[in-house]
């Protein structure tokens, strides 16, 4: 019996009946054994077939076998009801070997030419299976030359049998207070050869409740308890199960905060598995009763471990723990069934006693001493000498606990001194220097510090003066002795003020003319305004209309009088404004350098002389009456003039204050 080629030789070739293409002889028996490599099969087909036809091919035949299985017994030329001829059929071995047997009996009625066949080894596609047969692989089958391999979907691992996919279903930990878990692929059939472990792990104090839902189908056995597939539930105190079959297990109240669920499957079966909905419970906390004027959120039927509530107060009420305020309040239920914080109160907002208003007073409108939410108070300034700035003085206790003005301001109103008040009424005519009476020049300030000078009170903590008068003290402001509220230069009865800082105009150059001869002194304390101490007003934009040529201004001071001594009593003089060109011309001739009079200066005095300010008056105010507001304002600052005060054809020169309003305002607002 000839053997066909064996692997690793190339496996292909031709087979033919003895004597082919001539007729075959009687009593012949020929056997071929073909062997292909592992993972390969043999394919065989006939190009010629002509054998004696007999019932069930008993006489002459070709038999194809693979292992113990006969693939075909062939005879004749064409197939009949009971006999088979190969025709165009292709035959395949079942494994890697194929046996071909040819036999002829003792006689032939006529000559038959036999057969010719060709064979070859080809790869087996193990991944293709006949309908109804079990698939080669659980999930994915991959064919290759000489073999195949299986692989698994994500979440699965190939079992050591190399075909089954076991679920990767262990190590899942559920920490939420409720949830769902199920067998892998539920409600589709669960995987074979798997061992699943699920953990529910809640905070201490919780108790897990398990409910089996929808359907339950785990392989079972009529006599033995769950021998194939089973579900077990384990807590720190007891074990439940094993469970299998088709009946939904009852609810399990574990009384434990940790649960382990184990699900084991074998290699066979087709069952849909299980689904568990778990919840948890804990010892409830006492129901929170909202404090008066407050409410609880969220509202729940009960509050258990980890549940929380917040308290919100009605508008105008605030959270308080005793005397201590809280912005928010949230309490959390603890495992022992108590809240972690005590309930606060919602107390009516109390803005407290309003702050005192400097130079003003406060009146309770709602009721004596009432300072709670929506209470109203009224601030007012001391009449005559103070006026309220910007504000109407009405404040309401708002929900944030602050007294708030109608404009939404939380700061106190400001009582600003009324400026430009004087006891003096002016006559239109010019007359000689006179003694001032009380209240005539309440802005007048006496400045002592090396020399005698003057200034004018602005607001209640600034003094306007000439730069040359305080230049020497610019770095030692505290050396300035500032007195106000008195008429007599040497009187012990005056209001003392001290300087905090001196601001000299940056454009002023000492001993090089008097341009920009202006300075501000900041007092270290506010002075109390009264009939003898009142600030002078700064000029309005429209003030120039009251300072035209020949308009009368008033200068006051303790400077040199005609007798050549400093005045004991405050003196004043009413003098007209002089045309600027006329004044400029008066100071163009020697000994005065050209350009002595600048646009930042104004001149006042009589052509005939005799009325003037003099040394010791420096820094004092030249004031004018604003007939619209009926307030006095500072138009000039006593700056310089001829060596001989009151000289005919010469005039007093004053710093023109209206040119310096931005400078004054900037310094006062910045400091």
């Amino acid at each position: 019996t000839p053997l066909g080629p064996k692997w690793p030789e190339p496996v292909f070739g031709r087979l033919a009946s003895p004597g082919f293409p001539g007729e075959y002889a009687n009593d012949q028996e020929r056997r071929w054994t073909l062997t292909a490599p592992p993972g390969y099969r043999l394919r065989l087909y006939f190009t010629h077939f002509d054998l004696e036809l007999s019932h069930l091919c008993e006489y002459d035949f070709v038999k194809l076998s693979s292992g113990a299985k006969v693939l075909a017994t062939l005879c004749g030329q064409e197939s009949t009801d009971t006999e088979r001829a190969p025709g165009k059929d292709t035959f395949y071995s079942l494994g890697s070997s194929l046996d071909i047997t040819f036999r002829s009996d003792y006689s032939n009625e006529k000559p038959f030419t036999g057969f010719e066949a060709f064979y070859a080894a080809e790869d087996i596609d193990e991944c293709q299976v006949a309908p109804g047969e079990a698939p080669t692989c659980d999930h994915h089958c991959h064919n290759h030359l000489g073999g195949f391999y299986c692989s698994c979907r994500a979440g699965y691992v190939l079992h050591r049998n190399k075909r089954t996919c076991s679920a990767l279903c262990s190590g899942q930990v559920f920490t939420q207070r409720s949830g769902e878990l199920s067998s892998p692929e539920y409600p589709r059939p669960y995987p074979k050869l798997s061992s699943c472990t699920y953990s529910i792990s809640l905070e201490e104090g919780f108790s897990v409740i398990l409910d089996f839902v929808e359907s339950f189908d785990v392989e079972t056995h009529p006599e033995t308890l769950c021998p194939y597939d089973f579900l077990k539930i384990q807590t720190d105190r007891e074990e439940h199960g094993p469970f299998c079959g088709k009946t939904l297990p009852h609810r399990i109240e574990t009384k434990s905060n940790t649960v382990t669920i184990t699900f084991v499957t074998d290699e066979s079966g087709d069952h849909t598995g299980w689904k568990i909905h778990y919840t948890s419970t804990a010892q409830p906390c006492p129901y929170p009763m909202a404090p008066p004027n407050g409410h609880v959120s969220p509202v729940q039927a009960k509050y258990i471990l980890k549940d929380s509530f917040s308290i919100f107060c009605e508008t105008g009420y605030e959270l308080l723990q005793g005397h201590l305020p809280l912005k928010s309040f949230t309490a959390v239920c603890q495992k022992d069934g108590s809240w972690d914080r005590p309930m606060p109160a919602c107390s009516i907002v109390d803005c407290g006693p309003p702050d005192d208003l400097p130079s003003g007073r406060v009146e309770y409108i709602t009721g004596p001493g009432v300072t709670t939410y929506k209470a109203v108070i009224q601030y007012s300034c001391e009449e005559t000498f103070y006026t309220m700035k910007v504000n109407d003085g009405k404040y309401v206790c708002e929900a944030d606990g602050f007294w708030t003005s109608s404009k939404g301001e939380k700061s106190l109103p400001v009582c600003e001194p009324v400026c430009g008040l004087s006891a003096r009424t002016t006559g239109g005519r010019i007359y000689g220097g006179q003694k001032a009476k009380p209240g005539d020049f309440p802005w007048q300030v006496l400045i002592l510090g090396g020399t005698t000078a003057a200034g004018a009170l602005l607001y209640d903590n600034w003094v306007l003066t000439a730069a040359h008068a305080v230049y020497e003290q610019k770095h030692d402001a505290s050396a300035l002795d500032i007195r106000m509220g008195t008429l007599k230069r040497l009187s012990p009865h005056y209001t003392q003020a001290w300087s905090e800082a001196v601001f000299i105009h940056e454009g002023y150059t000492h001993d090089a003319g008097f341009d920009n001869d202006i300075a501000l002194i900041k007092l270290n304390n506010k002075v109390v305004i009264n009939s003898n101490i009142t600030p002078i007003c700064l000029p309005r934009k429209e003030a120039e209309s009251f300072m035209r040529t020949d308009d009368i201004g008033t200068a006051s001071g303790w400077g040199l009088t005609q007798r050549g001594f400093l005045a004991r009593n405050l003196m004043y003089v009413d003098i007209p404004i002089v045309d600027h060109q006329k004044c400029t011309a008066a100071y163009e001739k020697p000994p005065y350098p050209r350009g002595s009079v600048t646009a930042n200066m104004l001149c006042a005095g009589l052509e005939s002389g005799g009325k003037d300010s003099c040394r010791g008056d420096s820094g004092g105010a030249l004031v004018f009456l604003d007939s619209e507001t009926e307030r006095w304002f500072v138009g000039g600052i006593v700056s310089w003039g001829s060596m001989n005060c009151g000289e005919a054809g010469q005039y007093g020169v004053y710093t023109k204050v209206i040119n310096y309003i931005p400078w004054i305002e900037n310094i006062i607002s910045d400091f």
Epitope: Q321, G322, L324, P325, L326, K327, P342, G401
Partner: antibody
Framework: QVQLQESGPGLVKPSETLSLTCTVS?????????WNWIRQPPGKKLEWMGY???????SYNPSLKSRITISRDTSKNQFSLKLSSVTAADTAVYYC???????WGQGTLVTVSS | DIVMTQSPATLSVSPGERATLSCKAS??????VAWYQQKPGQSPRALIY???YRYSGIPARFSGSGSGTEFTLTISSLQSEDFAVYFC?????????FGGGTKVEIK
């Protein structure tokens, strides 16, 4: 971790103003709570001076009301104490604390002496 | 002002024993009372708030009780680190006030 730290001069002259600052880290002073100043004279009990709340409102011990000011700088997460016209009786360890004392500063000794 | 009176001024206890500290308020303060522990040279350490609520991190041997005007701090089993001065504090009304302290010393 919430931390409070007092800072300021350890020596103040009589009649002058005592100034201390409490710097808070780990929690915003505008988020919630009252922020207190408390002092403890040597060998004596604790004395609450006043607080400034998360909203900026203040509450003072009436015995100090005319001399005390508590303010805050929210940009620096600090609150401050000013106590004017001090005398030797104001010598103490000064603490800042939160609300009803869950967190305290380490304290700073202020001596009033000429 | 609400006066907080602590008694006794000094308490001598052996380690492992129970210590009971009392604090009386001169008027009703609800449960708005806190307890502090203070050791020499250190700032106070908060133990209890709202009369009976223990701060996190405070050992369970410390417990507080009471309401209205009478309050108690109990240390169930004194440890060596518990020997210190203990203050009660009311925050119910302005001005907030403190007790004079109870010194717990080793017997």
């Amino acid at each position: 971790q919430v931390q409070l730290q007092e800072s300021g001069p350890g020596l103040v002259k009589p009649s002058e103003t005592l100034s201390l600052t409490c710097t808070v880290s780990g929690y915003s002073i505008t988020s919630d709570y009252a922020w207190n100043w408390i002092r403890q004279p040597p060998g004596k009990k604790l004395e609450w001076m006043g607080y400034i709340s998360y909203s900026g409102r203040t509450s003072y011990n009436p015995s100090l009301k005319s001399r005390i000011t508590i303010s805050r700088d929210t940009s620096k997460n600090q609150f401050s104490l000013k106590l004017s016209s001090v005398t030797a009786a104001d010598t103490a360890v000064y603490y800042c604390s939160r609300h009803y004392g869950d967190y305290w500063g380490q304290g700073t000794l202020v001596t009033v002496s000429s | 002002d609400i006066v907080m009176t602590q008694s006794p001024a000094t308490l001598s206890v052996s380690p492992g024993e129970r210590a009971t500290l009392s604090c009386k308020a001169s008027q009703n303060v609800g449960t708005n009372v806190a307890w502090y522990q203070q050791k020499p040279g250190q700032s106070p350490r908060a133990l209890i708030y709202s009369a009976s609520y223990r701060y996190s991190g405070i050992p369970a041997r410390f417990s507080g009780s009471g309401s209205g005007t009478e309050f108690t701090l109990t240390i169930s089993s004194l440890q060596s680190e518990d020997f210190a001065v203990y203050f009660c504090h009311q925050y119910n009304a302005n001005p907030l006030t403190f007790g004079g302290g109870t010194k717990v010393e080793i017997k």
